[in-house]
């Protein structure tokens, strides 16, 4: 999916008002210095591509993020403010219902959510030069 035509300001507002808090809740009890940010993004569409991938694609050691509150809210924001995104999710949603992985917070998941926090922060500061 190409995120170029999303309403970035409305997605940013949703992140600031609610998604960010859910990410913090998920990470509660974890030191902010515990994980190094290894995933980066260069512009807003690229950031959303990486955010979608890390949030919804199961990875080795972390198969369960899609059911978390921050993930549900991310999906809603993309469906509402990214033209045509919802139709790409019809089959994906049905597949996810079949999988229905249990919600388990592993260290790998915590690391992944830490990466997500970094991607979202980068999404909110699109004019900063890449380090």
């Amino acid at each position: 999916y190409d995120f170029t035509n999303c309403d970035f300001e409305k997605i940013k507002a949703a992140y600031l008002s609610t998604i960010s808090k859910d990410l913090i809740t998920y990470m509660s009890g974890t030191k902010s210095t515990e994980f190094n940010n290894t995933v980066s993004c260069s512009n807003r569409p690229h950031c959303l591509t990486e955010i979608q991938s890390l949030t919804f694609n199961p990875t080795a050691g972390c198969a369960s993020l899609a059911k978390e509150m921050f993930a549900m809210k991310t999906k809603a924001a993309l469906a509402i403010w990214c033209p045509g995104y919802s139709e790409t999710q019809i089959n994906a949603t049905q597949a996810m219902k079949k999988r229905r992985a249990a919600k388990v917070t592993t260290n790998k998941c915590l690391e992944q959510v830490s990466q997500l926090q970094g991607l979202w922060r980068r999404f909110n500061r699109p004019l900063l030069k890449q380090q």
Epitope: T18, A76, I80, G84, S86, E87, I90
Partner: antibody, heavy 120, light 107 residues
Framework: QVQLVQSGAEVKKPGASVKVSCKAS????????MHWVRQAPGQGLEWMGT????????DYNQNFKGRVTMTTDTSTSTAYMELRSLRSDDTAVYYC?????????????WGQGTLVTVSS | EIVLTQSPGTLSLSPGERATLSCRAS??????VHWYQQKPGQAPRLLIY???QSISGIPDRFSGSGSGTDFTLTISRLEPEDFAVYYC?????????FGQGTKVEIK
């Protein structure tokens, strides 16, 4: 089963405000956005806007910007649509309709409609 | 804003005949089109979603097709209860919009 029950018909004077309610039952309220659509007598359907409880935010059709406010009360699973500075051409049936925001993504259930008549 | 244009405005047919309703979008919207039926004094009822997906409880004489800018709702054999107004809607991008409707009336 899924039900959306709207408040009763209203008669208002030009310049007044109206607040229509839509009580939902039979599903998880926060899994769906609530959309509002109106239909003037003998006319087609016009999308007014939506409130997304999951994100606690709204998005409105520019045609109504500044005149409409959509809210929800998640404790009672009720959505509200307030339209201000009413004009005679706001006379219409106002519908609420739910739409999944993390699945389905379509207006699959509608309220029965609320007739709002604006007349001096 | 995406404009949906439905044609014809009115379709006069007899029970048992086939009805073909068209909906054209002002720009490509992939398959983000849904079809509703509305009878006098009633709320719209969803018939088809995402261009061709069927809804449980809707008779299989209703079918949809199309993608991009051109979409079609087909009623294979009109039953007396099918005479109504039909609307297409796009949810590709905000603001969501509806076509002006096609009235299917008894000839």
């Amino acid at each position: 089963q899924v039900q959306l029950v709207q408040s009763g018909a209203e008669v208002k004077k030009p310049g007044a405000s109206v607040k229509v309610s839509c009580k939902a039952s039979g599903y998880i309220f926060t899994d769906y956005a609530m959309h509002w659509v109106r239909q003037a007598p003998g006319q087609g359907l016009e999308w007014m806007g939506t409130f997304i409880p999951l994100l606690d935010t709204s998005d409105y059709n520019q045609n109504f910007k500044g005149r409409v406010t959509m809210t929800t009360d998640t404790s009672t699973s009720t959505a509200y649509m307030e339209l201000r500075s009413l004009r005679s051409d706001d006379t219409a049936v106002y519908y609420c309709a739910r739409m999944g925001v993390t699945h389905s993504y379509v207006m699959d259930a509608w309220g029965q409609g609320t007739l709002v008549t604006v007349s001096s | 804003e995406i404009v949906l244009t439905q044609s014809p405005g009115t379709l006069s047919l007899s029970p048992g005949e086939r009805a073909t309703l068209s909906c054209r979008a002002s720009q490509p919207i992939s398959i983000s089109v849904h079809w509703y039926q509305q009878k006098p004094g009633q709320a719209p009822r969803l018939l088809i979603y995402f261009a061709s997906q069927s809804i449980s409880g809707i008779p299989d004489r209703f079918s949809g097709s199309g993608s991009g800018t051109d979409f079609t709702l087909t009623i294979s054999r009109l039953e007396p209860e099918d005479f109504a107004v039909y609307y297409c809607q796009q949810t590709f991008s905000l603001p969501y919009t509806f076509g002006q409707g096609t009235k299917v009336e008894i000839k």
